[in-house]
């Protein structure tokens, strides 16, 4: 089962109310990067997995959930240094003996190929080229995600150009 990711879209014409009001836009907050329907924030500091999870929560977001191989590739393309890796929202559930996304869904065998041990206290991180498991207590960078949000800007029609 893949992590469920809400998709949002907006009909530009439907939301155009006045010529002096800009259409609703799907925007990412400042410092966040847009990747299709998500906003991603790549941390600059390092933390154990649990602290990374908590940090994303304080930002009203979650650790990155990866839906499929395409999304993995798109995310990895944003990692410009092959020597830096990031925690994502996937860890090993000892009770269920399976990799589990933080939204409660389980890793499909076709989604990601994880290099490393599947055992207690293992969490997953991604690099530019690979996906690894590591002790959750290891201090690494991390990626938070949130959905695109609607932002309404009132501006003059000239600024539409």
């Amino acid at each position: 089962q893949k992590p469920s990711i809400g998709k949002c879209s907006v009909d530009i014409q439907q939301n155009r109310t006045k010529t002096t009001e800009r259409p609703d836009l799907l925007n990412c907050p400042i410092y966040w990067q847009q990747v299709q329907e998500k906003c991603l924030l790549f941390s600059h500091t390092v933390n154990p997995w649990n602290n990374s999870l908590a940090d994303c929560s304080t930002k009203e977001s979650s650790l990155l959930l990866i839906q499929d191989k395409d999304e993995l590739t798109r995310t990895q393309n944003l990692i410009h240094d092959k020597a830096i890796s990031f925690w994502i929202g996937l860890n090993f559930s000892l009770s269920e003996k399976n990799w589990k996304w933080i939204n409660g869904s389980f890793l499909s065998s076709n989604d990601l190929k994880i290099t490393g041990d599947a055992k207690e206290n293992s969490c997953v991180y991604i690099s530019q080229t690979s996906v690894y498991s590591e002790y959750c207590s290891t201090e690494m960078k991390w990626i938070c995600q949130k959905e695109l949000t609607l932002v309404r800007n009132k501006v003059s029609p000239d600024s539409w150009l």
């Epitope: 390092v46 020597a83 830096i84 207590s137 290891t138 201090e139 690494m140």
Partner: antibody, heavy 122, light 108 residues
């Protein structure tokens, strides 16, 4: 300038103690795993100890466990190695080394200091 | 502990030669291997990590290959500054992070 500078080496009698220091500059010290690695005269390299960025995770080689203590002060950009109950076989150049950030506890050492010589002899 | 055996222990070569150094691990270490260069009186320098990734700033004449237990460092065209001792290092998650015994590349 990105660099590591060790200090504190010297001549000490067997059973004695020394405290090595490593001053880091030019990078965000608090984000990196740091290690001590040693090299006996004319010999190969031996990893001694590592410490995680926050200092919460530490590991030692069996040869120094119970005798050496690694620590760090991120506010001072400094790494330390307290060496007690020193033996003749601890004689070596001690290097402070930074690990690549990416690789968790898979410690590849991408930045090294010049080393400080510790001689244990009566 | 995982043991690393380097061969040869020394090699004599000329400028322009292709030099190959091997490192064998006592058990499977996947691709968790690095190569370092050390010159007399100097600290080691990271050349290759993750078995085949070239460290930033290292000339492309250096390359690494292998996985599992058998690894190779190749210098495609030896330069005067390449005469040094080379060490492999395994970095599986569990310490200790052992080094090979070294291979000295000397001028023929």
């Amino acid at each position: 300038q990105v660099q590591l500078v060790e200090s504190g080496g010297g001549l000490v009698k067997p059973g004695g103690s020394l405290r090595l220091s490593c001053a880091a500059s030019g990078f965000t010290f608090a984000q990196y795993y740091m290690s001590w690695i040693r090299q006996a005269p004319g010999k190969g390299l031996e990893w001694v100890s590592y410490i995680s960025p926050s200092g919460s995770t530490i590991a030692y080689a069996d040869s120094v466990k119970g005798r050496f203590t690694i620590s760090r002060d991120n506010a001072k950009n400094s790494l330390y190695l307290q060496m007690n109950s020193l033996r003749a076989e601890d004689t070596a150049v001690y290097y402070c080394a930074r690990s690549l950030m990416a690789t968790g506890t898979h410690l590849y050492f991408d930045l090294w200091g010049r080393g400080t010589l510790v001689t244990v002899s009566s | 502990d995982i043991q690393l055996t380097q061969s040869p222990s020394s090699v004599s070569a000329s400028v322009g030669d292709r030099v190959t150094i091997t490192c064998r691990a006592s058990q499977d270490i996947s691709s968790w291997l690095a190569w370092y260069q050390q010159k007399p009186g100097k600290a080691p320098k990271l050349l290759i990590y993750a078995a085949s990734s070239l460290q930033s700033g290292v000339p492309s004449r250096f390359s690494g290959s292998g996985s599992g237990t058998d690894f190779t460092l190749t210098i495609s065209s030896l330069q005067p500054e390449d005469f040094a001792t080379y060490y492999c290092q395994q970095v599986t998650s569990f310490p200790p992070y052992t080094f090979g015994g070294g291979t000295k590349v000397e001028i023929k």
